[in-house]
Structures are given as C-alpha cells and as structure tokens.
C-alpha cells in the first residue's frame, strides 16, 4: 500500500466502513510532524486532520469519519506546505470488517450453529474456527451469513471456538483485511468451560483469507 | 455471454462534441456490482481510463476530463453513452466501452466493445 | 495518479521461449494489478487479475506474480499466436491507469 515518494511508506485501514485510518512511515522525517489533508471529494478543497496518531511525540498518521463513504480518498502528506506523498485511492480495498459481536453457541448432540450479528453490508464471508486439544491445527468453516453450523464433533471433548468476519476478496480485493478474531470460547458437553484445562499452547490460527 | 457494441464514432471538427453510444446484449447493465466504463485508446496506442457509470447510476470521471464528458446510461436500451465537448486534435482515440469485474468500480475491466473511432480534425 | 512503467517496450522472440514482461508502479498497490493482450485490430482482453489470479479461458502458459510496486507477467513456451501487445493496469489508485504497453513480436 506504501509509496516510494520521497520514502514515505502508507498504511490504509478502512475499519468497517466506518473509519479510515492512513499511518505513514517517513525514515527521512522521523523528527518532523507531517500534516495529513483529505478530501473525499475531487472538487473540495483540502480539509486537515483533526484526530492525528503519535508515535514518539510526532504525527504519524490520521483518524477519519468516513461512515457511508464508500469511494475514494483524496489525501496529501505534508512537511509544512512541502507534499512529500499524495495519493487518491479507493478505500473498499483496505476495507477491514468489524469483529463479530453478539457471538451465541446453539448445542445439538454432536453439532454447533454458531450465530452473531451480521454486519450491515455484504459480500462478506463469517469464519469459525474451532479445535480440540487433540487436534494439531484449527478447523474451519466459514459462511455468507453468520450462522455457521459445524457437524460431527465429540461431545465428550472440549472445544476452544473463535470467529472473525472477511471481505469477499472477488468483490473487494484481495488486499483486504480480516477482522479481529472474537474471545475464544470454550465448550464440552454443551456448556461453556472457562478453558479447555488439558488444551497445550494452542497452534496459531491458519491465517487463510 | 455480454456483447457490447460501441457506435458513433466518426470525424469531429475541433470545438465539435461527439455522442457515443454502446449497446449491451447478453446481460443488464443494471445488474447489482458492475461498473461499466469508457476508455480510449490513442494512436500511439496508450491507453486511458475516461470514467465509469455503475448499476446505481453514481459516476465517476478521470479530473483531466471531467469538465468536457458525460456518461449516461439508458435501461430500456440497455445502452451507455459518452458525451464529450470542446474536442480538439488529441481527442482522436479508438473509445472503448467495457464492464468491470464483480465487485464495482475498483477492478479490471473482463468485456471490451469492438472500439469505435473518433477523429477530430478540420 | 499512480504511473505504471513497463519495461521492456519491445520484444522478438522465437516460439517455445519463455517471455518475462515487468511493470514497476509508482506507488504501492498491493496486489491489485491486472494484465491485458491485445492483438492487432483487436480489443484487450483480460489475462490475469490481482496480480496472480487466472481467468477462465486464459492459457495456462500466461502467469503473473509480484505485490507491492513490481510485478512480472510470464509466458511460458511462448506460441505464434501470443504476438501482440501487453499492458499493466492497476485499480486502487483513482484514477486507473495503464502501462505504455510492451509489444511482442515472434521471430
């Protein structure tokens, strides 16, 4: 996403069509406080951040309400009136979902609906990822909504679940961010455990997009 | 299978305007995520985005033409259409219509018209 | 806008060659770069998406790879029928825009 003006490397995060977040690294200004103005229109003048990160004292990137907006970013980095990076982008391909809420676990023998609340927009897909302490690597199954029923697990074994929401990357590209992975929970027998006691370091999650 | 055919093209005298049309069969250009674009081709055959329209009507124009064109669509024809002023010599160009991948505005472009030429000269 | 910058503009190669066709952008574009041919008298056509991604009906010989800023397209066991003219488009930036195109021609 970083560009080689001037050394200046960009980050975009779109969170959850809500908030854009653009952080720059600028080995060259590494003591300066570049400005960052935006305009989400080609025709406005530019506006100034008024919400900036800081990274040891000095700017280094900008919070924006950008709700309902789902086209394009006009943005300039400046080092007084000097633009040391500017760009125009479209901020659905740093789009990153927000983490799924209102997560619930419905029990039936030897299978689990994992429900939450789907997000307002679509074209995403809704991840659960679930493994027991026997199993060397997490499971996963994903669905369009989030209703996602998982079959033919032991109900004598306790199982560690987790769920997290990503852009259909044939809609929004594939540079695209997941969300943040809800709680882990846990579960045996159809109630909720606070660990799964005999469970080792549990391996890392498969970082599929 | 989408077929898009572009018309209209032809000789235009400079500060003339041109109104090209490009009829698609085979699928409706109101159909949800698709974007549907112009993009001209000069003869020294670099190519240049013009501007979409989407199946939301919402447009977008490239800033170095935006003052001079016009995209429009018509449902009933199925058709889109580019209108273009103030046309001068480095105006003449192959114009190309052609649909986006799924997923809108942001992406390659799978189905290209034939082209059609415009050549502006006194 | 973001320039796409091709190298090289022209290529004579003789079939069964392997072809390495290169676009270096302005900016970082993560993967969202997408090639074209064009044969004379006739329309692009899509060859790959994102970067890596095939497209149905596209010979397998063509592939692409690269993230970032460079990115590389390859014909493997080039044919006679691969002569034509390829372009490099990138889509995060607004506006897109186009690589000045590196013709191939077969010996």
């Known amino acids: 996403q970083g560009g080689a003006a001037e050394g200046v490397q960009i980050q975009i995060i779109y969170f959850n069509l809500e908030t854009v977040q653009v952080t720059w690294n600028a080995s060259k200004y590494s003591r300066t406080n570049l400005t960052f103005h935006y305009r989400f229109n080609g025709d406005e003048a530019y506006d100034q951040c008024t919400n900036y990160l800081l990274q040891e004292g000095h700017t280094s990137g900008c919070l924006l309400d950008a709700e309902q907006r789902d086209d394009i970013l006009y943005f300039s980095i400046r080092n007084g009136t000097h633009p040391v990076f500017t760009a125009s982008r479209w901020m659905v391909y740093y789009l990153k979902p927000s983490s799924p809420k209102h997560v619930r676990f419905s029990w039936h023998q030897d299978a689990v609906t994992v429900t939450c609340s789907d997000l307002s927009y679509g074209d995403l897909l809704y991840e659960v990822q679930y493994r027991s302490p026997f199993d060397t690597e997490w499971q996963s199954k994903q669905e369009n909504t989030c209703n996602v029923t998982i079959e033919g697990l032991d109900a004598e074994k306790c199982y560690s679940f987790w769920v997290r929401v990503k852009a259909m990357e044939d809609v929004y590209g594939p540079d695209t961010y997941p969300s943040d992975w809800s709680e882990v929970t846990c579960w045996q027998r159809g109630e909720i455990r606070d660990a799964c006691a005999e469970t080792p370091t549990p391996p890392k999650p498969k970082l599929s997009k | 299978q989408v077929q898009l055919v572009e018309s209209g093209g032809g000789l235009v005298k400079p500060g003339g305007s041109l109104r090209l049309s490009c009829a698609a069969s085979g699928f409706s250009i109101t159909t949800s995520g698709y974007y549907w674009t112009w993009i001209r081709q000069f003869p020294g055959k670099g190519l240049e985005w013009m501007g979409y329209?989407?199946?939301?009507?919402?447009?977008y124009y490239n800033p170095a033409l935006k003052s001079r064109i016009t995209i429009s669509r018509d449902n009933a024809k199925n058709s889109l259409y580019l209108q273009m002023n103030s046309l001068r010599a480095e105006d003449t160009a192959v114009y190309y219509c052609?649909?986006?991948?799924?997923?809108?505005?942001?992406?390659?472009?799978?189905?290209w018209g034939q082209g059609t030429l415009v050549t502006v000269s006194s | 806008e973001i320039v796409l910058t091709q190298s090289p503009d022209f290529q004579s190669v003789t079939p069964k060659e392997k072809v390495t066709i290169t676009c270096r952008a302005s900016?970082?574009?993560?993967?969202?770069l997408h090639w074209y041919q064009q044969k004379p008298d006739q329309s692009p056509k899509l060859l790959i998406k994102f970067a890596s991604r095939s497209i149905s009906g596209v010979p397998s010989r063509f592939s692409g790879s690269g993230s970032g800023t460079d990115f590389t397209l390859t014909i493997n066991s080039l044919e006679a029928e691969d002569a034509a003219t390829y372009y490099c488009?990138?889509?995060?930036?607004?506006?897109?825009?186009f690589g000045q195109g590196t013709k191939l021609e077969i010996k």
């Open positions: 488009q990138q889509s995060p930036g607004f506006p897109p825009t």
């Open positions: 900016q970082s574009i993560g993967t969202s």
């Open positions: 329209i989407g199946y939301n009507s919402k447009t």
């Open positions: 052609a649909r986006s991948l799924y997923g809108g505005y942001k992406d390659a472009f799978d189905s």
